[in-house]
Interface confidence: medium
Amino acid sequence: TQNKALPENVKYGIVLDAGSSHTSLYIYKWPAEKENDTGVVHQVEECRVKGPGISKFVQKVNEIGIYLTDCMERAREVIPRSQHQETPVYLGATAGMRLLRMESEELADRVLDVVERSLSNYPFDFQGARIITGQEEGAYGWITINYLLGKFSQKTRWFSIVPYETNNQETFGALDLGGASTQVTFVPQNQTIESPDNALQFRLYGKDYNVYTHSFLCYGKDQALWQKLAKDIQVASNEILRDPCFHPGYKKVVNVSDLYKTPCTKRFEMTLPFQQFEIQGIGNYQQCHQSILELFNTSYCPYSQCAFNGIFLPPLQGDFGAFSAFYFVMKFLNLTSEKVSQEKVTEMMKKFCAQPWEEIKTSYAGVKEKYLSEYCFSGTYILSLLLQGYHFTADSWEHIHFIGKIQGSDAGWTLGYMLNLTNMIPAEQPLSTPLSHSTYVAHHHHHHHHHH
């Protein structure tokens, strides 16, 4: 007779990534007895919540409960009922909510409060909802990709898990692009981190890491586009804005009130003698690139070297994983292959942006027009940000790996966040016996979460 399989001794964790444009729920699973090992936690499910980011619910907080229902119900189905009560749930909100908090602390609190009340209605172990800092977002993204790549493991393998994995223990840098912010995080080579705000110290699995990180608020792809439009309409002095970042023949009416709604456009705000203007695409990569560069102030730098806007950036070092929108956009444009040089990417972008809008709509009939229309801008923005913003070159471009998933888990900050909050990244090399909490990593961003 066949042996009956023993019940798996596994644990689950849930993290909700409340981004500026949407919310995603991730379910992670790991063997209970191996929770201190590196690389054992993996993602079993991603559920994308239908609708915008939570910051958009500021005037309709009563709809937040319904908004979260489908994905929370999905979590109920995926995770065995017997595990529900011990499955932690964390919600981390990023730059969309940081911007809302800048506008009004009270409104941001109101949104988070309703989110917390909604999530505490489920049978899981809800650990709270909070706005994570840009530094945390960068740090946890870095932890995620290096954890998944096996960089923290002391056992060097003779085989590679993933095509871009190098067989050494040098960590990968992390490049994260969201809708409202972008993060750059890496271990510089013997370089003093001249700005304390950008320095993180970790001890992970018995090794010390001095990590550089910075989050550029307002430089996510969506907010960068709003910035660019606000900058350009200042000069246009007309109700028509001929825009090189949109395909020839593309037209869209924009409300000035929408343009000035975000704190990101405040520096360009002026009294315009019209309430609306029309974007008319002219599809010119080079001109789009030039326009984007005006968003980066490179004339001021109080350090040995800067990215832009006076923010310290050490010399780039090693390989980088570029994920989130860096990946989604480049994947759409079919530019994620390791073999595609920076010159080739630029060439492809020139061709893509110059394609007439009607042609683009026909070629990508299944793609929502709102998203489709912005790929020319987003692709050009990615190139501008990486080359002029972060000072990658045609040569160092080869060290950027556009990553969607590693070993089936999405690259992003959520896994690193959960590993830290569940104390699953030990500061010292795990022994055969479980360690006390005191030996776990506790870098200076570890906030205690309240239980409901």
Epitope: V235, A236, S237, E239, R242, F274
Partner: antibody
Framework: QVQLVESGGGVVQPGRSLRLSCAAS????????MHWVRQAPGKGLEWVAY????????YYADTVKGRFTISRDNSKNTLYLQMNSLRAEDTAVYYC????????????WGQGTTVTVSS | DIQMTQSPSSLSASVGDRVTITCRAS??????LIWLQQKPGKAIKRLIY???TLESGVPSRFSGSRSGSDYTLTISSLQPEDFATYYC?????????FGQGTKVEIK
Amino acid sequence: QVQLVESGGGVVQPGRSLRLSCAASGFTFSDYGMHWVRQAPGKGLEWVAYISSGSSIMYYADTVKGRFTISRDNSKNTLYLQMNSLRAEDTAVYYCARDLYYDHVLDYWGQGTTVTVSS
Amino acid sequence: DIQMTQSPSSLSASVGDRVTITCRASQEIRGYLIWLQQKPGKAIKRLIYAASTLESGVPSRFSGSRSGSDYTLTISSLQPEDFATYYCLQYTSYPRTFGQGTKVEIK
């Protein structure tokens, strides 16, 4: 092809009025902002006034503010400059030029029409 | 108002010479500058926009560049048809302002 043709210039006494026209063809006039620019004899170019495509925006140089009015008739593809209380220093060749950010900023100009203010 | 200081006001050069004309902006204009060419009896012609973008149909011997608040028009090898007056114009704010002009004459 794009054409801008100014007319309405002439000799006029100080204090009197004159209306200049600029007839546009070869492009979608109603999409473009339009400028008037002038050049006094032997001098450089001086910007005078601007009107947006839908006439909702008008800008004037301080030297003509309150005396000159820019207007347009999109159905007739025509730009106008109504000049009142003319002074000797308004004597110049007046040019119209089209404007559309990003790539069509003052990219086509007319040949100009001469206005002489003299008693 | 933004002042555009153009220099030189005139220059004499020979065919084949390299010629540079500079405009300095009194305030930040962020590259919003065009270069114009004026010849007697002809319509004014735009050569360069956005400080460095060459108008289609304009010979490649013309180029525009920027260094801080200084904007330069360069004619790499002067041709007989290039003898004219050149103006810069800023379009970052109103009132639009021109440089004083540079007359390029035959030596």
